[in-house]
Amino acid sequence: LEVSESPGSVQVARGQTAVLPCAFSTSAALLNLNVIWMVIPLSNANQPEQVILYQGGQMFDGALRFHGRVGFTGTMPATNVSIFINNTQLSDTGTYQCLVNNLPDRGGRNIGVTGLTVLVPPSAPQCQIQGSQDLGSDVILLCSSEEGIPRPTYLWEKLDNTLKLPPTATQDQVQGTVTIRNISALSSGLYQCVASNAIGTSTCLLDLQVISPQPRSV
């Protein structure tokens, strides 16, 4: 019995269906096929879990969190024992192993390993202003998404004809901040932050209104 080399890793967007490949060749009939799919979760590597089991011509559920979401892609028994996971969750990220036995066929490699990474687009970011909006002050525009795998980068732009930030602005695309020094009336306006990663983008808006001092009445 020989389990074929798998592609190494599968990436899927959260909520979508992942297909984890596993196929084998055997010299025996598939009368005593036994397949166990296990996962070593990234979030808890010390706690391997059973995903799904095929034994004695029957399928059995694994860990509770996979119930109703996992199945074999084809009719069993078969030499293609790939599985699907519906409605993938972040917690599904991990290393998946298919363990195949088909007595009396012995020897050879009976384990296939595939990594699953569940990707998450940036969630709706929060746009905030830090600091006083008084003329001449320094302000920081903050943008942050609670979720996003891979970690999002952030790009700020001013929603005027140029989409350029004021000349006194410095941007940190990793932290999601823009520092605008010595704000003037020209700094006022609508700013947009775009959070992006490999599978998506999200945006938020912020209105910066520079407050000019009231002229003193004599």
Epitope: P121, A124, E147, G189, I199, T203, L206, D207
Partner: antibody, heavy 121, light 112 residues
Framework: QVQLVQSGAEVKKPGASVKVSCKAS????????MHWVRQAPGQGLEWMGW????????GYAQKFQGRVTMTRNTSISTAYMELSSLRSEDTAVYYC??????????????WGRGTLVTVSS | NFMLTQPHSVSESPGRTVTISCTRS????????VQWYQQRPGSAPTILIY?????PSEVPDRFSGSIDISSNSASLTISGLKTEDEADYYC???????????FGGGTKVTVL
């Protein structure tokens, strides 16, 4: 009370322009962006753009760029939307709506009653 | 660019619960908040839900909003349906500088 009062219905010929007004009362006019949204008869809502009453800065939907002009007069707390080169498919009710940007996302918490613009030859 | 798709109409009896979906065609539903508006016949729209599930104080708690990642959609649920709930309902989101503010096509709710 807090309200947006729009100008009356208009009938225009194709190729003409129309200017709709929206007078705000009961709140600080310059403190909120004003948006314009239209609705063709029996159809859904279509966003046209915004104006910052404080600065006069505008942002228009791509579809209307070059044909729409949004202005304001802060002394009378009034926003205006002018649409040029009118065609029959511009027949719609035009709404002004006050925009809120709570945590970075537009929503419209106050609407005018709408102005019906009919384009007909 | 994405679109927001709503069912054209739904109908239900008074006292029952009705749910209206708003499906985002591409990109994640979590990427931008969703708002919901009610428009009664002959009237301007009014806000019901903002930022997915927040409800203005004047809106009855019979109206609630939620998000479902697996179907990439937002939903408006109206419980204890009343005849005065007969109206068109619109979802709305933001599509960045290229699209600006987007509305769904609207759903007509009929109370039987």
């Amino acid at each position: 009370q807090v309200q947006l009062v729009q100008s009356g219905a208009e009938v225009k010929k194709p190729g003409a322009s129309v200017k709709v007004s929206c007078k705000a009362s009961g709140y600080t006019f310059t403190g909120y962006y004003m948006h314009w949204v239209r609705q063709a008869p029996g159809q859904g809502l279509e966003w046209m753009g915004w104006i910052n009453p404080n600065s006069g800065n505008t942002g228009y939907a791509q579809k209307f760029q070059g044909r729409v002009t949004m202005t304001r007069n802060t002394s009378i707390s009034t926003a205006y939307m002018e649409l040029s080169s009118l065609r029959s498919e511009d027949t719609a009710v035009y709404y002004c709506a006050r925009g809120r940007l709570e945590r970075g996302y537009w929503y419209f918490d106050l609407w005018g009653r709408g102005t019906l613009v009919t384009v007909s030859s | 660019n994405f679109m927001l798709t709503q069912p054209h109409s739904v109908s239900e009896s008074p006292g029952r619960t009705v749910t209206i979906s708003c499906t985002r065609s591409s990109g994640s539903i979590t990427s931008n908040y969703v708002q919901w508006y009610q428009q009664r016949p002959g009237s301007a729209p009014t806000i019901l839900i903002y930022e997915d599930k927040e409800r203005p104080s004047e809106v009855p708690d019979r109206f609630s909003g939620s998000i479902d990642i697996s179907s990439n959609s937002a939903s408006l649920t109206i419980s204890g349906l009343k005849t005065e709930d007969e109206a068109d309902y619109y979802c709305q989101s933001y599509g960045g500088t290229s699209q600006g503010v987007l509305f769904g096509g609207g759903t007509k709710v009929t109370v039987l």
